[in-house]
C-alpha cells in the first residue's frame, strides 16, 4: 500500500467496548454526591451519544448545576444530585448502521 | 398489595432439568427500574442468590451457576420463570423469588417452593 | 465475588437486651449493604436498606450504621417476637451476595 492509500473499514454497528463498566445499573448516591454514568462503545463510523432521562431527550438545562457531557469518554457525570435526579438514563448510541442504549437506574438518598 | 408466589415440581431426579415459575401481582414489570431475582437457601443453611431480570430484559446471573441458568419474563401474564439445567442433590432447597424497585434490596418476597433431587 | 462475614454466629439475649450485629465486606462495598429478617419456616423480611435507611412498616428499635466494609444492625431493646436469623446482603457489586447469617436466640 502507498502511503497516501487509506484502508476502508467495514461499517460496523455500535457496540459497547467495556461492558464490566456498565455492570452496575442501580447507583444509590447520598444527596449531595457525584454520579457518573459511563457507556464505552465503538463502531464504523464512529457512533455519537445521547442521553434520556426517563425516556425524554436529557440536556440538563432544567437542572441545578446541570450536567457534563463527556463524549471522548462516553459519559455523563451530575454533580450535587438532589431527590428529583432520580430516575431511569439511558444511554442511546447509534451510527449509521446501528443503534445500542443501556439504562441505568438513579436513586438519590 | 404486593404478592409474590413460586411454584415448581417439587421432586425431580439427578440429570433433569427443573422449571419454576414466579407469579406476581401488585406491579408490572414493564415498569422503570423494576426487578425480579431467585434465590434459594438449602435448609438450615444461608441464602444464595441466583438470578435477576430488569424491566427492560436486563439480566444477570451467579457466575458460579451461569451456564445452567436462564431467567425469562411474561411481562403480560405477570410471571417470572427460571431454569436450570442438570440438577443435582446439592440443588435441594428452597427456591425464592424476590422483587426489587429502584432498589438492589429485596422489599417483597413469595413464600419459597421446596424442590428436592433424588434418585 | 465479594464475602460478608457475620458475627457473631449466635447470640444469646434477654428481652430489653440491646444488641448489634456485625457483617463485614471482604471489600469496600460503600452503603451497598442491606439487612433482612428470617424466622423460622418464614421468608426474610427486609429490615434496613443501603446500611441505615429505615423500611415502612419496620418497628423503629431496628437500626443500621456502617459504609465501607464494617457495618452494624442495631437493636435498641429486643422484643421476643426478635427472636430468629439475621442475614446482611450486599449489592455492591455481581453476584449479589449475602452473609451467613446470625442466629438470635432467648437466653
Known amino acids: 500500500l502507498e502511503a497516501s492509500e487509506e484502508v476502508e473499514l467495514e461499517p460496523q454497528a455500535p457496540y459497547w467496548t467495556h461492558p464490566q463498566r456498565m455492570e452496575k445499573k442501580l447507583h444509590a448516591v447520598p444527596a449531595g454526591n457525584t454520579v457518573k454514568f459511563r457507556c464505552p462503545a465503538a463502531g464504523n463510523p464512529t457512533p455519537t451519544i445521547r442521553w434520556l432521562k426517563d425516556g425524554q431527550a436529557f440536556h440538563g438545562e432544567n437542572r441545578i448545576g446541570g450536567i457534563r457531557l463527556r463524549h471522548q469518554h462516553w459519559s455523563l457525570v451530575m454533580e450535587s444530585v438532589v431527590p428529583s435526579d432520580r430516575g431511569t438514563y439511558t444511554c442511546l448510541v447509534e451510527n449509521a448502521v446501528g443503534s445500542i442504549r443501556y439504562n441505568y437506574l438513579l436513586d438519590v438518598l | 398489595q404486593v404478592t409474590l408466589k413460586e411454584s415448581g415440581p417439587g421432586i425431580l431426579q439427578p440429570s433433569q432439568t427443573l422449571s419454576l415459575t414466579c407469579s406476581f401481582s401488585g406491579f408490572s414489570l414493564s415498569t422503570s427500574g423494576m426487578g425480579v431475582s431467585w434465590i434459594r437457601q438449602p435448609s438450615g443453611k444461608g441464602l444464595e442468590w441466583l438470578a435477576h431480570?430488569?424491566?427492560?430484559?436486563?439480566?444477570r446471573y451467579n457466575p458460579s451457576l451461569k451456564s445452567r441458568l436462564t431467567i425469562s419474563k411474561d411481562t403480560s401474564s405477570n410471571q417470572v420463570f427460571l431454569k436450570i439445567t442438570s440438577v443435582d442433590t446439592a440443588d435441594t432447597a428452597t427456591y425464592y423469588c424476590?422483587?426489587?424497585?429502584?432498589?438492589?434490596?429485596?422489599?417483597?418476597w413469595g413464600q419459597g417452593t421446596t424442590l428436592t433431587v433424588s434418585s | 465475588d465479594i464475602v460478608l462475614t457475620q458475627s457473631p454466629a449466635t447470640l444469646s439475649v434477654t428481652p430489653g437486651d440491646r444488641v448489634s450485629l456485625s457483617c463485614r465486606a471482604s471489600?469496600?462495598?460503600?452503603?451497598?449493604l442491606h439487612w433482612y429478617q428470617q424466622k423460622s419456616h418464614e421468608s426474610p423480611r427486609l429490615l434496613i436498606k443501603?446500611?441505615?435507611q429505615s423500611i415502612s412498616g419496620i418497628p423503629s428499635r431496628f437500626s443500621g450504621s456502617g459504609s465501607g466494609t464494617d457495618f452494624i444492625l442495631s437493636f435498641n431493646s429486643v422484643e421476643t417476637e426478635d427472636f430468629g436469623m439475621y442475614f446482611c446482603?450486599?449489592?455492591?457489586?455481581?453476584?449479589?451476595?449475602f452473609g451467613s447469617g446470625t442466629k438470635l436466640e432467648i437466653k
Open positions: 424476590a422483587r426489587d424497585y429502584y432498589a438492589s434490596s429485596f422489599d417483597y
Open positions: 431480570i430488569y424491566w427492560d430484559d436486563d439480566k
Open positions: 443501603y446500611a441505615s
Open positions: 471489600q469496600s462495598i460503600s452503603n451497598y
Open positions: 446482603q450486599q449489592s455492591n457489586s455481581w453476584p449479589f451476595t
